[in-house]
Amino acid sequence: IWELKKDVYVVELDWYPDAPGEMVVLTCDTPEEDGITWTLDQSGEVLGSGKTLTIQVKEFGDAGQYTCHKGGEALSHSLLLLHKKEDGIWSTDVLKDQKEPKNKTFLRCEAKNYSGRFTCWWLTTISTDLTFSVKSSRGSSNPQGVTCGAVTLSAERVRGDNKEYEYSVECQEDSACPAAEERLPIEVMVDAIHKLKYENYTSSFFIRDIIKPDPPKNLQLKPLKNSRQVEVSWEYPDTWSTPHSYFSLTFCIQVQGKSKREKKDRIFTDKTSATVICRKNASFSVQAQDRYYSSSWSEWASVPCS
Amino acid sequence: VPGGSSPAWAQCQQLSQKLCTLAWSAHPLVGHMDLREEGDEETTNDVPHIQCGDGCDPQGLRDNSQFCLQRIRQGLIFYEKLLGSDIFTGEPSLLPDSPVGQLHASLLGLSQLLQPEGHHWETQQIPSPSPSQPWQRLLLRFKILRSLQAFVAVAARVFAHGAATLSP
């Protein structure tokens, strides 16, 4: 058993048929010694008396808010939550496996630049009686500070008969050093509590591996005189790290015909302009990636040829 | 470079960008193969990293690029020695068309651009003997290449910025 926060405790249980459970001793936080009784949640049933209560915690029916009383007045509360371990593996019932970039990916994180700011998100089909909180650090054995904001409900989607909820959090490394080579990974820990079930999820990454630039901005087409060609130009996204002579991007450009089946020629360039043949009804697209490290490509930015 | 002269920024830029390409072709992102699951806070401590105080940021380069260039050169020599060690030459053998050979040569080439013959900066101690098991060697190769990708990315940024802003 360990304390999650004041008056909230997590009991770790091996979860199998006829498991013995855990013996837990609760102590009433009061100077009083006599006339103390204990109840669980709203049931008025007295579970025991005295300053301490010893219980065997085996199942969810044994979890909940234990209250000690004297003379009809509540003296203190202890909320017990259960953390299930089945076959040596902690339960992951609350969050959905996003399966990207690999199986058992419950948390996904992205950064738009090297400033030390990043966003993580996760999915669940549960919404009632649910709590999420987040902590983060750089490194685990001698952790350096990362400050996370409050978790937000960032999207609701209908998937067949089910509603899916997306939650997200933004974090910022306290002393980020954008130009340095990261040595220790960022650790993100999400606590999830559904009713009386506690679970925790972690993700470990380097900022460099979760970089995904915003799409290039200000796409412009300039037709060239007496030619089928056009000059296309674009700019670095505003959110990308500066100076651009140091934090450089590379670009992938393509012209896409109206039909999705039409062959697309992709061209890679470090410049912010190119000359292409842009037929009527086609569209020109460009995406960006860090020039020196193969993290994710941005989403495409597009503009019609006509 | 030693004694405060400027490097051939443009040449260094070209070669460092080539190093980035080679490092990624030697070990592409194998489905985001997570090599940090091996308790990695310790395993990467012995490789040289370009850290915050090394002056490799744009301001540090403007003030005095020598600290940063020395750190980059130390790293290049360290990785060059690693790629020439039995971690990479032992079993399992590299494929004949493996870019590791080119990568090895390019590391050497860039380190020499930063220190012409006759100058000697102290270099870091070369790592301990390689593991005996082929599978351990393979895992170590992946880790070294992943670490090298991060190192050469910073080096390439330094030279790109130098070529754009510090070239005479």
């Epitope: 009686d129 709590t131 999420f132 909180s133 904001g149 409050a150 978790v151 937000t152 | -």
Partner: nanobody, 122 residues
Amino acid sequence: EVQLVESGGGLVQAGASLRLSCAASGRTFRSYNMGWLRQAPGKEREFVATISWNAGIPYYADSVKGRFTISRDNAKNTVYLQMNSLKPEDTAVYYCAASNSWSSSARFYDYWGQGTQVTVSS
């Protein structure tokens, strides 16, 4: 730390509307998720609604969905609960609460107001 003071409660007829306000003191108001919770006599405290620090997607308990609306004004350090089509079963003490977690549970809010009584007569 944040201090919370609720107002706007009162006695109304079924079908009527009320607007509760919660004024927060402390510069950090805009960084907290805010919730409304309620407790009817002899019952457990129950979750009503929550709104994120950035005034993003609100979330409601099924019992109030479509009738109640939570909103916030970060410039005024205030969170509101607009209650329409009130029913006798909405009678309770309504509490405003703040948390750094996201929660649709009445158990995990860090800071609480003193509460304001809402009574709906039939």
